[in-house]
Amino acid sequence: NECPELQPPVHGKIEPSQAKYFFKDQVLVSCDTGYKVLKDNVEMDTFQIECLKDGTWSNKIPTCKIVDCRAPGELEHGLITFSTRNNLTTYKSEIKYSCQEPYYKMLNNNTGIYTCSAQGVWMNKVLGRSLPTCLPECGQPSRSLPSLVKRIIGGRNAEPGLFPWQALIVVEDTSRVPNDKWFGSGALLSASWILTAAHVLRSQRRDTTVIPVSKEHVTVYLGLHDVRDKSGAVNSSAARVVLHPDFNIQNYNHDIALVQLQEPVPLGPHVMPVCLPRLEPEGPAPHMLGLVAGWGISNPNVTVDEIISSGTRTLSDVLQYVKLPVVPHAECKTSYESRSGNYSVTENMFCAGYYEGGKDTCLGDSGGAFVIFDDLSQRWVVQGLVSWGGPEECGSKQVYGVYTKVSNYVDWVWEQMGLPQSVVEPQVER
């Protein structure tokens, strides 16, 4: 009872390979690497057939089908290009993931090359089957900032895209009658997080406790240029409001906070994060020049009484920016200690401005980023946040603006954002 001779399938083999097969002999059909046994539309690794008593085989020889990794997974903020013709997704085909440049960059400078493995899985030499990660690029505006800037008091209109990290934070506390409304600025750190000053987000409470405003009362605008036209801007509600636990409302020490956005914002030419500095207690060096932008008061001749009576009409419609030098700590401390009132310039603050005045940040600029260009990384880094100033009018002589020293809080910021620093190293100033 001899069974007919067997022909192995294309790209496959039969074992054992014999000249003759008799009743009860069994053969195992398998395929070459990168191919799978296909029998009745079912894929399997091997298939066994048996020589029957009547001299026939128990089944027909199956075929060998090339492994297909199928369409690769979508990469958030990324693109896929096929290296093989006809966009093949079969064994040994190659694809390349890339990030949406210039707004995103691949983590760890991965090649992004994936090959279809014999197991039918897209594989990368470093990451295995895991997809790469596209991280937002930071501190690189789509248009370069001009090197010479005159003086937000004495400031200049910012072109759209000059400060793509600039956020307008609007707080409307509807729990009071009438509703309380105020605003400040902030800086985008990632697609989901805004850095700002704690005093912008502290509830206008009856007591001295540090309680954040309710997240429902916070709206963040990004990509905003002219406050009269919010149509082109991205607006987002807050998922979380986090004040620094040690924020002191008496002296504004630790004046730093974060807002987590409800949804990540799409990055583009007008919406890009700023870079965080390295952890360094010294902060920015004296005399270094920084830029700060805001929609605060832009007229140095407006008195506080006029501000009150005109409501928000004294605000700048168009985002303003100013270039200011960092003031030596001792000089700033002295200038405030010589004033009547209990002013305290702590080690968590630095000052910026000019002795002669005329250039300054003002009411409504609070929480905005004081950025310095880092020559090494060729990126803009947030070194300060607009915090407070003296009792005189903004831009007065020898009244320096006081800024939160962000470099003292880098660990706290990463911790709140839930990202270990190693993972986000490309975002840190290098």
Epitope: T174, S175, R176, K181, R206, G311
Partner: antibody
Framework: QVQLVQSGAEVKKPGASVKVSCKAS????????IEWVRQAPGQGLEWIGE????????NYAQKFQGRATFTADSSTSTAYMELSSLRSEDTAVYYC??????WGQGTLVTVSS | DIVMTQSPDSLAVSLGERATINCKSS????????????LAWYQQKPGQPPKLLIY???TRESGVPDRFSGSGSGTDFTLTISSLQAEDVAVYYC????????FGQGTKVEIK
């Protein structure tokens, strides 16, 4: 329209407690602060404290800390103020008000032995 | 606590004449963040709860006659009744809500 209706007058003995209610209507009760103010006969107004019904957050004037307790029942849109360890000088009309604008009609609490 | 001091304690004004009540706070009521003064004025008639007239130092509550106006900033505030009417006879209170709220002691307005 917005209305706050308070419970009726109370007579209490020194050392006892009193609980005054304030039923709100015409607005979203949970979203606005309810303040409590009192006025002794022939005297001025004195702020006791406030509660935000939606969160239960409270603020108290130092003088009433530990003696006044505010609660709120969102299901009935009613705020409550309980004042304990009553003394004769607590005799006053107690008002509830929505943040700053709308006042209840007042509840006279008389403390007398 | 912020202390609110009203002056005068009582005021007698002829019908149709101007009545001015002052209120001084022991510290500034101007919040730099909102650029508002957290000061309100109330009117209380005998046997009635107080009624809000002015908030944020100078904003008139809806339905309040325009003869009532508020002014001032920081620590010094004024309520003005430009032309006193018979129905304006009452006690007027200022209240700060910048911090734990406190009221002024009240000013009684009568007709001369």
């Amino acid at each position: 329209q917005v209305q706050l209706v308070q419970s009726g007058a109370e007579v209490k003995k020194p050392g006892a407690s009193v609980k005054v209610s304030c039923k709100a209507s015409g607005y979203t009760f949970t979203g606005k602060w309810i303040e409590w103010v009192r006025q002794a006969p022939g005297q001025g107004l004195e702020w006791i404290g406030e509660i935000l019904p939606g969160t239960g957050s409270t603020n108290y004037a130092q003088k009433f800390q530990g003696r006044a307790t505010f609660t709120a029942d969102s299901s009935t849109s009613t705020a409550y103020m309980e004042l304990s360890s009553l003394r004769s000088e607590d005799t006053a009309v107690y008002y509830c008000l929505r943040s700053e604008d709308v006042w209840g009609q007042g509840t006279l609490v008389t403390v007398s032995s | 606590d912020i202390v609110m001091t009203q002056s005068p304690d009582s005021l007698a004004v002829s019908l149709g004449e101007r009545a001015t009540i002052n209120c001084k706070s022991s510290q500034s009521l101007l919040a730099s963040r909102t650029r508002k003064n957290y000061l309100a004025w109330y009117q209380q008639k005998p046997g009635q709860p107080p009624k809000l007239l002015i908030y944020w130092a100078s904003t008139r509550e809806s339905g309040v006659p325009d003869r009532f106006s508020g002014s001032g900033s920081g620590t010094d505030f004024t309520l003005t009744i430009s032309s006193l009417q018979a129905e304006d006879v009452a006690v007027y209170y200022c209240k700060q809500s910048y911090n734990i709220p406190t009221f002024g002691q009240g000013t009684k307005v009568e007709i001369k």
